[in-house]
Amino acid sequence: GITNINCSGHIWVEPATIFKMGMNISIYCQAAIKNCQPRKLHFYKNGIKERFQITRINKTTARLWYKNFLEPHASMYCTAECPKHFQETLICGKDISSGYPPDIPDEVTCVIYEYSGNMTCTWNAGKLTYIDTKYVVHVKSLETEEEQQYLTSSYINISTDSLQGGKKYLVWVQAANALGMEESKQLQIHLDDIVIPSAAVISRAETINATVPKTIIYWDSQTTIEKVSCEMRYKATTNQTWNVKEFDTNFTYVQQSEFYLEPNIKYVFQVRCQETGKRYWQPWSSLFFHKTPETVPQVTSKAFQHDTWNSGLTVASISTGHLTSDNRGDIG
């Protein structure tokens, strides 16, 4: 970087190398070049010569002033015009940064995804800081008073094997960067209350041609949790509003849920579950598409990526989709 160049003088920043975005700052350049009384001193930002707000302080030093500096990063260097030198002589360079102190982390959430072996803690970091910001997650046992700390740049996965202090914990997050430090409120958790069941997955759909055609959605989860509550939401792809059906589920066998849908319309389905009575839900499952036939029965299975139609009783067709903006993986 620019900081590794051999200097013939100094370049420095007031009040500091990293500063709050939007501040007025001064950059100073002091030449110390043998046999050179600089005629002129020049400043460059990201390789472009600055032409305004430069003041010569004395024979060897000049100052560049920036009002309301808003760039997250800039490489600064300065040069001197020496008599009898054809080119400008490099004095020194420095990388400068501007940003914000961290906001107070909020919405601290810790969950254990079934079978993961980890407790995953996330939080809302607030506004972008533009500079390197680290987070320390504090986990304190309410039974043993023992506290563990985990350093991270975003979220954290903590092995459940390392949580040896019983079931009840306090969790809080400290955010820190070069410009400041903030601490979240404390979250009290019980390990048994934060387990999210293994993901529920829609495997196929089938429309049965009865007097009133009905669509059966087949879905399942590998969870070992006995009492699970689930929601399935569905809508025509042309609609904005979801319809939601609730289920108390026992996953000892594949679930079959019946829907009476309009013919010849493409629908999208998603499912999510939680341990009954607990706080956190799974994220919604991947989008599952199914188009109802006009009169012909149809099966949709996860195996194919395009619609195919056939006059037979059960016909495979599209199934999978991807997460979209109305399909956020919320766990709250």
Epitope: T3, W12, T17, F19, K20, N24, R63, L179
Partner: antibody, heavy 117, light 107 residues
Framework: QVQLVQSGAEVKKPGSSVKVSCKAS????????ISWVRQAPGQGLEWMGW????????NYAQKFQGRVTITADESTSTAYMELSSLRSEDTAVYYC??????????WGQGTLVTVSS | DIQMTQSPSSLSASVGDRVTITCRAS??????LNWYQQKPGKAPKLLIY???SLQSGVPSRFSGSGSGTDFTLTISSLQPEDFATYYC?????????FGQGTKVEIK
């Protein structure tokens, strides 16, 4: 040779304010910044804030935000630090220091502020 | 905020000894580190700026090194006038912060 000369010692009551001055000579006052640093008895050094004399730009430590005001008067080459809502833990020697080469190269002699009821 | 941690907090040495004081920053500060000497009842005095540059008028027995998070002040041959408290200070970001100080005492 740059010199920074500070005002004399002060004794103040809790809740009151103090204003310490720092007069510069022997250099171009407007060419540099001035910081204020304090030192409680037997303790280390603590930076309070900075002012760019020519531009009037200030930057304060969060700990003192709202209680400290740093100003500069170019015509008299003097910087000022005012600390309000004084409490006993503000008893300290207060120094002004010149910013140069991203360091404090010249310091005032210090002003003892005693906060006592 | 960047925390500066000095070690040791105090040391006893004899005239002529080589003395080393270390300063660690809680995060990388490049070369934006300064060293000061303070004697009782006096203002601090700048010794080293930008991690390794000797301030004008400071004896050459003082030297500084390091970058990133770990820095060292070395006095190659301790003199009677060097018994004092030494502080490191980062100028990388505001708030500008100092180490807690290292007191160099006569053995």
């Amino acid at each position: 040779q740059v010199q920074l000369v500070q005002s004399g010692a002060e004794v103040k009551k809790p809740g009151s304010s103090v204003k310490v001055s720092c007069k510069a000579s022997g250099g171009t006052f407007s060419s540099y910044g001035i910081s204020w640093v304090r030192q409680a008895p037997g303790q280390g050094l603590e930076w309070m804030g900075w002012i760019s004399a020519i531009f009037g730009t200030t930057n304060y430590a969060q700990k003192f935000q709202g209680r400290v005001t740093i100003t500069a008067d170019e015509s008299t080459s003097t910087a000022y630090m005012e600390l309000s809502s004084l409490r006993s833990e503000d008893t300290a020697v207060y120094y002004c220091a010149r910013h140069w080469l991203q360091s404090f190269d010249y310091w005032g002699q210090g002003t003892l502020v005693t906060v006592s009821s | 905020d960047i925390q500066m941690t000095q070690s040791p907090s105090s040391l006893s040495a004899s005239v002529g000894d080589r003395v080393t004081i270390t300063c660690r920053a809680s995060q990388s500060i490049g070369g934006d580190l300064n060293w000061y000497q303070q004697k009782p009842g006096k203002a601090p005095k700048l010794l080293i700026y930008a991690a390794s540059s000797l301030q004008s008028g400071v004896p050459s027995r003082f030297s500084g090194s390091g970058s990133g998070t770990d820095f060292t002040l070395t006095i190659s041959s301790l003199q009677p006038e060097d018994f004092a408290t030494y502080y490191c200070q980062q100028s990388y970001s505001t708030p500008l912060t100092f180490g807690q100080g290292t007191k160099v005492e006569i053995k």
